[in-house]
């Protein structure tokens, strides 16, 4: 057993049948010694009598509110909640495996820029009785701040039969050089409470790996005279990194007819601008990529030839 | 270290080219060793990152840009800083600076080339003659010293008078191909900045 | 093995027009970038246009834009540059090139594969 927070406690509990549980003592946080009862949640049934109570905690029903009174006023509360081991693995049955990049991936993180800040996400089918807690540092042995906001209800879904719920948890690293080298990565801790079942997930990761460049903008085209040709061009995105010489980003043109049917033409360039031959109906996409560390494309920004 | 006298040419473009080289050829060689040694704990979250050009180089500190100084992060570990009298910038200490910042590269690709070239003769006596390093590779580090055109002392050659141990250092060439693809992509930023500047 | 093989140069007026022609073999070059670069007596290797594998997307030198224009024709693996307006300036050794890539580079050692050139003089 462990404190999770003032008053909160998780029992960690290998789960299999006609398991013993864990024994578990609890004391009343009073200078009180005599007269004492305990109780359970709402159930006005007394478990036991005295400054300490001893409970042997199996499954669920054994979880949740302890209350020590005297003449019906409440002393101390401690809530138990249960951390389950199936065949040594901990549980986690709260957030949803996404599955990218690559299986049991329930925490997916990424950075817009090397400013130090990121922000991360999950998902989840539980609508209620749900909380979150964040923790992040740069390494684990000697950890460096990173702080995080508080985690919030980002976008919902409807899957199938059930709807899908999207958290989001922004965070910044205290002391961030855009230009350092990352050797520590940054470490990321959720706690996760459904009723009365505790689960924690982690992710780690550098910076640089978790990099998704915003989209670039300003994407504009402009006719060239007597041709069927037209000069695209666009500009670095407004949350990047600069300078951008130096944090010089990549390019992928496209150009896409309306059919599938159409062949399709993809390049990259370093360049912001190009010229196209624009057919009717066609359209001009461009991507973004750092030019020297082949993290995510950014999504694609669009125009239409017409 | 031997610091040049000298200012740094201004055209950087040989150096950006051979830069651009540097790093294609170590993610290259990168992706070979990941794929050849994928029974190795060889890829970014297996390894422990070191850096053996640390306290003995400071290239991100003396490369740092301009518009990053201001930045008190990227100012910690500096024992000089561009900025000078009231913020003003020299041109002397700009170009003592760019100076700076070019040996430092220089003196991390000679680090880089003796290791990569002492553990290549260990990788050539290994019977499984499994994996070794690519000669694109050290020719294009090669390429980019001569021309950062600096002169400095040569470091002789590490011999080992010990039986290697194989799989250790194919778990060391591992740690220093990941470690040298971030170098050379620190290098990369720093040449087209330079470049444009 | 790829080999490219310029043609259509010579000798021209300012003002007059050329149309020169890269027919490449021994290998499909319909999936890669191909490009046009020059080289002057006594000055660099410069970047002239560059075009994508379908040909919808081309990147030009400022000093030939709107005058020069980049094409190709995939059924007969072959790349065209039209040269409209010629100047003096334009006097110089016209190379074609490819990485067997999708890069639209304009620097010469982003491209691999060189052809031999074909000399193109504008003299009045």
């Known amino acids: 057993i462990w404190e999770l927070k003032k008053d909160v406690y998780v029992v960690e509990l290998d789960w299999y049948p006609d398991a013993p549980g864990e024994m578990v003592v609890l004391t009343c946080d009073t200078p009180e010694e005599d007269g004492i009862t305990w109780t359970l949640d709402q159930s006005s049934e007394v478990l036991g009598s005295g400054k300490t109570l001893t409970i042997q905690v199996k499954e669920f029903g054994d979880a949740g509110q302890y209350t020590c009174h005297k003449g019906g006023e409440v002393l101390s509360h401690s809530l138990l909640l249960l951390h389950k081991k199936e065949d040594g693995i901990w549980s986690t049955d709260i957030l949803k495996d996404q599955k990218e990049p690559k299986n049991k991936t329930f925490l997916r993180c990424e950075a817009k820029n090397y400013s130090g800040r990121f922000t991360c996400w999950w998902l989840t089918t539980i609508s209620t009785d749900l909380t979150f807690s964040v923790k992040s540092s740069r390494g684990s042995s000697d950890p460096q701040g990173v702080t995080c906001g508080a985690a919030t209800l980002s976008a919902e879904r409807v899957r199938g039969d059930n709807k899908e719920y999207e958290y989001s948890v922004e965070c910044q690293e205290d002391s961030a050089c855009p230009a350092a080298e990352e050797s520590l990565p940054i470490e990321v801790m959720v706690d996760a409470v459904h009723k009365l079942k505790y689960e924690n997930y982690t992710s780690s990761f550098f910076i640089r790996d978790i990099i998704k460049p915003d989209p670039p903008k300003n994407l504009q085209l402009k006719p060239l005279k007597n041709s069927r040709q037209v000069e695209v061009s666009w500009e670095y995105p407004d949350t990047w990194s600069t300078p951008h010489s130096y944090f010089s980003l990549t390019f992928c043109v496209q150009v896409q007819g309306k059919s599938k049917r159409e062949k399709k033409d993809r390049v990259f360039t370093d360049k912001t601008s190009a010229t196209v031959i624009c057919r009717k109906n066609a359209s001009i996409s461009v991507r973004a990529q750092d030019r020297y560390y082949s993290s995510s494309w950014s999504e694609w920004a669009s125009v239409p030839c017409s | 270290r031997n610091l040049p006298v000298a200012t740094p040419d201004p055209g950087m473009f040989p150096c950006l080219h051979h830069s651009q080289n540097l790093l294609r050829a170590v993610s290259n060689m990168l992706q070979k060793a990941r794929q050849t040694l994928e029974f190795y704990p060889c890829t970014s979250e297996e390894i422990d990152h070191e850096d053996i050009t640390k306290d003995k180089t400071s290239t991100v500190e003396a490369c740092l840009p301009l518009e990053l100084t201001k930045n008190e992060s990227c100012l910690n570990s500096r024992e000089t800083s561009f900025i000078t009298n009231g913020s003003c910038l020299a041109s002397r200490k700009t170009s003592f600076m760019m100076a700076l910042c070019l040996s430092s590269i220089y003196e991390d690709l000679k680090m880089y080339q003796v290791e990569f070239k002492t553990m290549n003769a260990k990788l050539l006596m290994d019977p499984k003659r499994q994996i070794f390093l690519d000669q694109n590779m050290l020719a294009v580090i090669d390429e980019l010293m001569q021309a950062l055109n600096f002169n400095s002392e040569t470091v002789p050659q590490k011999s080992s008078l010990e039986e290697p141990d194989f799989y250790k250092t194919k778990i060391k060439l591992c740690i220093l191909l990941h470690a040298f693809r971030i170098r050379a992509v620190t290098i990369d930023r720093v040449m087209s900045y330079l470049n444009a500047s | 093995e790829v080999q490219l093989v310029e043609s259509g140069g010579g000798l021209v007026q300012p003002g007059g027009s050329l149309r020169l022609s890269c027919a490449a073999s021994g290998r499909t070059l319909s999936s890669y970038t191909m490009a046009w670069f020059r080289q002057a007596p006594g000055k660099e290797r410069e970047f002239v246009a560059t075009?994508?594998?379908?040909?919808?997307?081309?990147d030009y030198a400022d000093s030939v834009k709107g005058r020069f224009t980049i094409s190709r024709d995939n059924t007969k693996n072959t790349v065209y540059l039209q040269m409209n307006s010629l100047k003096h300036e334009d006097t110089a050794l016209y190379y074609c090139?490819?990485?067997?890539?999708?890069?639209?580079?304009?620097?010469?050692?982003?491209?691999?594969?060189w052809g031999q050139g074909t000399q193109v003089t504008v003299s009045s």
């Open positions: 075009i994508s594998p379908v040909g919808f997307i081309m």
């Open positions: 090139a490819t990485d067997l890539g999708r890069k639209l580079g304009t620097q010469s050692c982003e491209y691999g594969y």
